[in-house]
C-alpha cells in the first residue's frame, strides 16, 4: 500500500504531513561529504501497535573521508520535510484529542542529514500545502492532498491551491486580498490556502479544479 507517486507538486508551495501513517519510510540521506555508516539503515520506518507508533531504525551519517566515526541522532526542533517543507510551521502540539493513532510524529533530525527529506508514503496519508514566502494563495477550498487507492492504483487528490507572486495583481472575479485590519476582512470566494508566520498571502486556483474557479458562490 505504498503510494506510487509523490504528492502533487504545486509551484511555489511546499507540503507537510502533520503525522506519518505506519508503513511510511524515510530515506537515510546524508549531506554532501557524508555517507551512511557501513552497517547503517537505509531508511527509518514508522511502525507501531494500537497504542504507540514510532520510527524504527536510526539514520547515521559519517564523513566520507573518515572510516570509523559514527554520528548520533541529535534531537532538535522540528525540521524540514520531504521536498523542502515550509518555514511557516509552528511546533507540533503535544499528543491530544486530535492526534492520530497509527501515525508517527516528524522524526528528529540526525547529524549531517541531507537538506531534503525523502519520504515514501502509504495509502491514506494526508499532506497539507502552504505557499512559500513571497507568494500568495487564493482560496477555494482546503489545501490538502490524500493518497488514495482507486481500482488497484494509488493516486493523490489535487489540493485546491495555486500560489502567485506577491507583486502579481491578477485575481479571480469576486476575490479580494485579505485586509490588514482585524475587522471586516473581505471574502475570498476562491478558496485558498496558505501562509507563513506573519505575512499574508492569497492564491489562485488551477482551472483544472473540480468546480469552475469562477464559481465560489456555492449553490
Amino acid at each position: 500500500e505504498l503510494c506510487d507517486d509523490d504528492p502533487p507538486e504545486i509551484p511555489h508551495a511546499t507540503f507537510k504531513a502533520m503525522a506519518y501513517k505506519e508503513g511510511t519510510m524515510l530515506n537515510c540521506e546524508c549531506k554532501r561529504g557524508f555517507r551512511r555508516i557501513k552497517s547503517g539503515s537505509l531508511y527509518m520506518l514508522c511502525t507501531g501497535n494500537s497504542s504507540h507508533s514510532s520510527w524504527d531504525n536510526q539514520c547515521q551519517c559519517t564523513s566520507s573521508a573518515t572510516r570509523n566515526t559514527t554520528k548520533q541522532v541529535t534531537p532538535q526542533p522540528e525540521e524540514q520535510k520531504e521536498r523542502k517543507t515550509t518555514e511557516m510551521q509552528s511546533p507540533m502540539q503535544p499528543v491530544d484529542q486530535a492526534s492520530l493513532p497509527g501515525h508517527c510524529r516528524e522524526p528528529p533530525p540526525w547529524e549531517n542529514e541531507a537538506t531534503e527529506r525523502i519520504y515514501h508514503f502509504v495509502v491514506g496519508q494526508m499532506v497539507y500545502y502552504q505557499c512559500v514566502q513571497g507568494y500568495r494563495a487564493l482560496h477555494r477550498g482546503p489545501a490538502e492532498s490524500v493518497c488514495k487507492m482507486t481500482h488497484g492504483k494509488t493516486r493523490w487528490t489535487q489540493p485546491q491551491l495555486i500560489c502567485t507572486g506577491e507583486m502579481e495583481t491578477s485575481q479571480f472575479p469576486g476575490e479580494e486580498k485579505p485586509q490588514a485590519s482585524p475587522e471586516g476582512r473581505p471574502e475570498s470566494e476562491t478558496s485558498c490556502l496558505v501562509t507563513t508566520t506573519d505575512f499574508q498571502i492569497q492564491t489562485e486556483m488551477a482551472a483544472t479544479m473540480e468546480t469552475s474557479i469562477f464559481t465560489t458562490e456555492y449553490q
Partner: antibody, heavy 119, light 106 residues
C-alpha cells in the same frame, strides 16, 4: 494545549446583528484556519464559513450576504458577525480549528455559545 | 452542490452488535471525515480522510468507502457509543455536513 472558546451575547433581538468572538490558544492564527459552524436546537450541524490562515474567507453561499468573518492574529481572536437576525438563527455557535494548516478536518472545537434570537 | 445523505437517520442497536451507518454523496468525492456528538457537548473529531481514527477513538470503530458511498462501522457496539455521527466533506466544493445518524441503545 490547543483551545478555542466562543463568547457571545446570549440573547439578541430579531433584525439586530450578532457578534461572537472565538479566542484561541496553543496555536497561531497565521498558520491554521478557523471555521464557524452552528447547530439549531435538536438539529444538525451547519457550516457558516472559514477564515484561512492568510485572512481570506470562504462562506456558505446561502448565508453569505449576512456573514462577516475576520480575525486579529496578534490577539488570537476570530470574529463572526451575522446581520439581520431571524428567529431561525437561534443556535449553538461553534468555532473549530483544522488539524493541518488550511485543511478540512475540524480537529479542535470550542464548547460553543448559545445564541437565542427573540423579542 | 454536493449533498451528503446519511442513513439510517436513527439506528437502534444492542450492545455487542455490529452496526454500519452510511453517508452517500450526490457526486463522487475523494474522502470523508466523521464526527461524534453527544447531547450537550461539542462535536468530536472521529475519523479523518475516510479511515484514520482520531486519538481516543476505540479500535472497534472503522471507516471505509470511496466515490459516492462511505460508511462508519462499529464491530461491537457499546453503550458509550450512543451518539449522533456526522459525515463531512470538502474534497469537492462546497463544504458540507451530512444530516447525522443517531445511534441509540436498545
Amino acid at each position: 494545549q490547543v483551545q478555542l472558546k466562543e463568547s457571545g451575547p446570549g440573547l439578541v433581538a430579531p433584525s439586530q446583528s450578532l457578534s461572537i468572538t472565538c479566542t484561541v490558544s496553543g496555536f497561531s492564527l497565521s498558520t491554521y484556519s478557523v471555521y464557524w459552524v452552528r447547530q439549531p436546537p435538536g438539529k444538525g450541524l451547519e457550516w457558516l464559513g472559514v477564515i484561512w490562515s492568510d485572512g481570506s474567507t470562504t462562506y456558505n453561499s446561502t448565508l453569505k450576504s449576512r456573514l462577516t468573518i475576520s480575525k486579529d492574529n496578534s490577539k488570537s481572536q476570530v470574529f463572526l458577525k451575522v446581520n439581520s437576525l431571524q428567529t431561525d438563527d437561534t443556535a449553538m455557535y461553534y468555532c473549530a480549528r483544522t488539524y493541518g494548516y488550511d485543511g478540512s478536518w475540524l480537529a479542535y472545537w470550542g464548547q460553543g455559545t448559545l445564541v437565542t434570537v427573540s423579542a | 452542490k454536493i449533498v451528503l445523505s446519511q442513513s439510517p437517520a436513527i439506528l437502534s442497536a444492542s450492545p455487542g452488535e455490529k452496526v454500519t451507518m452510511t453517508c452517500r454523496a450526490s457526486s463522487s468525492i475523494s474522502y470523508m471525515h466523521w464526527y461524534q456528538q453527544k447531547p450537550g457537548s461539542s462535536p468530536k473529531p472521529w475519523i479523518q480522510a475516510t479511515s484514520n481514527l482520531a486519538f481516543g477513538v476505540p479500535s472497534r470503530f472503522s471507516g471505509s468507502g470511496s466515490g459516492t458511498s462511505y460508511s462508519l462501522t462499529i464491530s461491537r457496539v457499546e453503550a458509550e457509543d450512543a451518539a449522533t455521527y456526522y459525515c463531512q466533506q470538502w474534497s469537492s466544493n462546497p463544504f458540507t455536513f451530512g444530516s447525522g445518524t443517531k445511534l441509540e441503545m436498545k
